[in-house]
């Protein structure tokens, strides 16, 4: 870290490696919860016009698709993969693509994905063909 930039104690706004290199924060779609028309498709665009700088460099992009008897919503946020989101671990946080995986939630259909390339939660993928370790 350069001498003119203070290093504060317990600073989670800055992530460094062993050489002192600094991690830049992720750029993610961040519209919180919005109504969605995404249904029965292999993939969908988020239709979120807001790309935000994640507050902490360790955060990744997350998308949550929910369908119940009344509506469909899509949530786009930044989140720290060390912490659960909607009570689920972000197990795919290192993926460059947002591959939706179904989670068990009573009373609704619930899919969630996380990823770590810029704006990767803009394109959410439901197709089974991506659910193996696809290099693309």
């Amino acid at each position: 870290i350069p001498p003119h930039v203070q290093k504060s104690v317990n600073n989670d706004m800055i992530v460094t490696d062993n050489n002192g290199a600094v991690k830049f924060p992720q750029l993610c779609k961040f519209c919180d919860v919005r109504f969605s028309t995404c249904d029965n498709q292999k993939s969908c665009m988020s239709n979120c016009s807001i790309t935000s700088i994640c507050e902490k460099p360790q955060e990744v992009c997350v998308a949550v698709w929910r369908k119940n008897d009344e509506n469909i919503t899509l949530e786009t946020v930044c989140h720290d993969p060390k912490l659960p989101y909607h009570d689920f671990i972000l197990e795919d946080a290192a993926s460059p693509k947002c591959i939706m995986k179904e989670k068990k939630k009573p009373g609704e259909t619930f899919f969630m994905c996380s990823c770590s390339s810029d704006e990767c939660n803009d394109n959410i993928i439901f197709s089974e063909e991506y659910n193996t370790s696809n290099p693309d």
Epitope: I1, P2, V5, D17, N19, G20, A21, V22, K23, F24, L27, I53, D118
Partner: nanobody, 124 residues
């Protein structure tokens, strides 16, 4: 030699405006995503805003979105930050930094060349 030189900081009252500049030299400005980053006294770094090298696509932290505007003049190798509706919590040293788009980490322990910073104080 790579240099980033920030200027334009100062004392301003709450609700006021300031325009910061960052003059870049020693590298191909149009190859880099540029950032404004700030550090309040005793706090960590906060990543304020970024702008792509070409096309001028911009990004903001939620804390400043709608109040701050980042821009760049590639012909002058200069980065700008227009800060409006300033608040006491915007008080910080403001740095500019460069990032190769797509690279998640700086190249070395000097933050891939950061400037020395310019102090912005918002107080009545």
């Amino acid at each position: 030699e790579v240099q980033l030189l920030e200027s334009g900081g100062g004392l301003v009252q709450p609700g006021g405006s300031l325009r910061l500049s960052c003059a870049a030299s020693g590298f191909t400005f149009t190859e880099y995503r540029m950032w404004w980053v700030r550090q309040a006294p005793g706090k960590g770094l906060e990543w304020v805003s970024a702008i792509e090298p070409i096309g001028n696509r911009t990004y903001y932290a939620r804390s400043v979105d709608g109040r701050f505007t980042i821009s760049r003049d590639n012909s002058k190798n200069t980065l700008y930050l227009q800060m409006n509706s300033l608040r006491a919590e915007d008080t910080a040293v403001y740095y500019c930094a460069k990032q190769i788009p797509g690279r998640k980490w700086t190249a070395n322990s000097r933050f891939d060349y950061w400037g020395q910073g310019t102090l912005v104080t918002v107080s009545s």
